[in-house]
């Protein structure tokens, strides 16, 4: 048994580290292997994680882990039985994908106006919460090529649109990301879409 | 409450031996590392020894290894010092301290202190 | 072994001034923790500030910690009467925990 893709990990920069590998063949994750990881920190304790399968030969393990601070530096052992299969270390401050957002709301009751909110993925004491921006992604149901991107480069999770940037009469979805510049961190995750009917008011055309 | 009570402090000549008991209440003790620090009359802080939660590792400041033994009852929840050869300059007052993981190293609940004196 | 230096040795500042508390490190402890305490005359010293810059729970905002590498700051905002103590900075790395010799706030 042997290792063709050594772990890779990323960070939620909160309480979870999602481990990554793959075997050079077909392997019960959970029965045949265990993760080990520990803070390198003085007189802290080795903790074991048991992986998941993730396709035939992947393996997916969750570390879980009491807050992270960009000191934090661990040890990483991937055991097979008594066989250390690799040894690393994994530093959570230089490998972070944020949380996604949540509760996306389009409030379409504001005028002509499309007032769009969510939720920040993560606490006020956690360092991240004030250091996440997004984007926001809107598109229609009924036309593949009316597909934008609205980057949120402020700290408030919000946006307002005119609706009149849209079309009226049809159905659009939106969906929320976000990332954090300070970490050079990954994009997160989309958050789930939410739908709406977009109408508005056409202006009065003279001619 | 979460509290941390020492005892077995006293006067002892130089040479001599003392274990110092520190009774944890209010949290599980296997689940924290524990540490003993120190305070000589006037001076600072210095860290004496520590040990991890499960008692697999310890750890002592220079000046006191080999000398002390630090040792943990957690069922009884009870964290010990094992103090012996002493020296003048261990008189101090001896702090029971806890750190919790989630502080990194930060001492969050402190004994109110035992005060031990070596002196012939 | 890592040394802690505080300066100064002792602050003399009025109540609602700003006080800033410095602490030194000998070598790079990135990969380490710093914390602050604070402890006033016949009690045991109390956690302020952990992981360079997080505040311990109760701790008023007042107080803040920043630094990286060698160069560590506690600063109080605005001083209060009962903010008048001795403070002390702590490393807690891999190897080793070591504290500084501690800075006296007094009153002006």
């Known amino acids: 048994m042997k290792v063709l893709q050594e772990p890779t990990c990323v960070s939620d920069y909160m309480s979870i580290s999602t481990c990554e590998w793959k075997m050079n063949g077909p392997t019960n994750c959970s029965t045949e292997l265990r993760l080990l990881y520990q803070l390198v920190f003085l007189l802290s304790e080795a903790h074991t994680c048991i992986p998941e399968n993730n396709g035939g030969a992947g393996c997916v393990c969750h570390l879980l882990m009491d807050d992270v601070v960009s000191a934090d530096n661990y040890t990483l052992d991937l055991w097979a039985g008594q066989q250390l299969l690799w040894k690393g270390s994994f530093k959570p401050s230089e490998h972070v994908k944020p949380r996604a957002p949540g509760n996306l709301t389009v409030h379409t009751n504001v005028s002509d106006t499309l007032l769009l909110t969510w939720s920040n993925p993560y606490p006020p004491d956690n360092y991240l919460y004030n250091h996440l921006t997004y984007a926001v992604n809107i598109w229609s149901e009924n036309d593949p090529a009316d597909f934008r991107i609205y980057n949120v480069t402020y700290l408030e999770p919000s946006l307002r649109i005119a609706a009149s940037t849209l079309k009226s009469g049809i159905s659009y979805r939106a969906r929320v990301r976000a990332w954090a510049q300070c970490y050079n961190t990954t994009w997160s995750e989309w958050s789930p879409s939410t739908k709406w009917h977009n109408s508005y008011r056409e202006p009065f055309e003279q001619h | 409450e979460v509290q941390l009570l020492e005892s077995g402090g006293g006067l002892v000549q130089p040479g001599g031996s003392l274990r110092l008991s520190c009774a944890a209440s209010?949290?599980?003790?296997?689940?924290?590392?524990m540490h003993w620090v120190r305070q000589a009359p006037g001076k600072g802080l210095e860290y004496v020894s520590g040990?991890?939660?499960?008692?697999?590792?310890?750890y002592y400041a220079n000046s006191v290894k080999g000398r002390f033994t630090i040792s943990r009852d957690n069922p009884k929840n009870t964290l010990f010092l094992q103090m012996s050869s002493l020296r003048a300059e261990d008189t101090a007052v001896y702090y029971c301290?806890?750190?919790?993981?989630?502080?990194?190293?930060?001492?969050?609940?402190w004994g109110q202190g035992t005060t031990v004196t070596v002196s012939s | 072994e890592i040394v802690l230096t505080q300066s100064p040795g002792t602050l003399s500042l009025s109540p609602g001034e700003r006080a800033t508390l410095s602490c030194r490190a000998s070598?790079?402890?990135?990969?380490?923790?710093l914390a602050w305490y604070q402890q006033k005359p016949g009690q045991a010293p109390r956690l302020l500030i952990y992981?360079?810059?997080r505040r311990a729970t109760g701790i008023p905002d007042r107080f803040s910690g920043s630094g990286s590498g060698t160069d560590f700051t506690l600063t109080i905002s605005r001083l209060e009467p009962e903010d008048f103590a001795v403070y002390y900075c702590?490393?807690?790395?891999?190897?080793?925990?070591?504290f500084g010799q501690g800075t006296k706030l007094e009153i002006k």
């Open positions: 301290v806890r750190v919790k993981l989630k502080y990194r190293g930060g001492m969050d609940v």
């Open positions: 209010g949290f599980t003790l296997s689940s924290y590392a």
């Open positions: 040990i991890s939660g499960n008692s697999a590792s310890t």
């Open positions: 070598q790079d402890i990135s990969s380490a923790y």
């Open positions: 992981g360079t810059s």
């Open positions: 702590q490393l807690y790395g891999a190897t080793s925990v070591t």
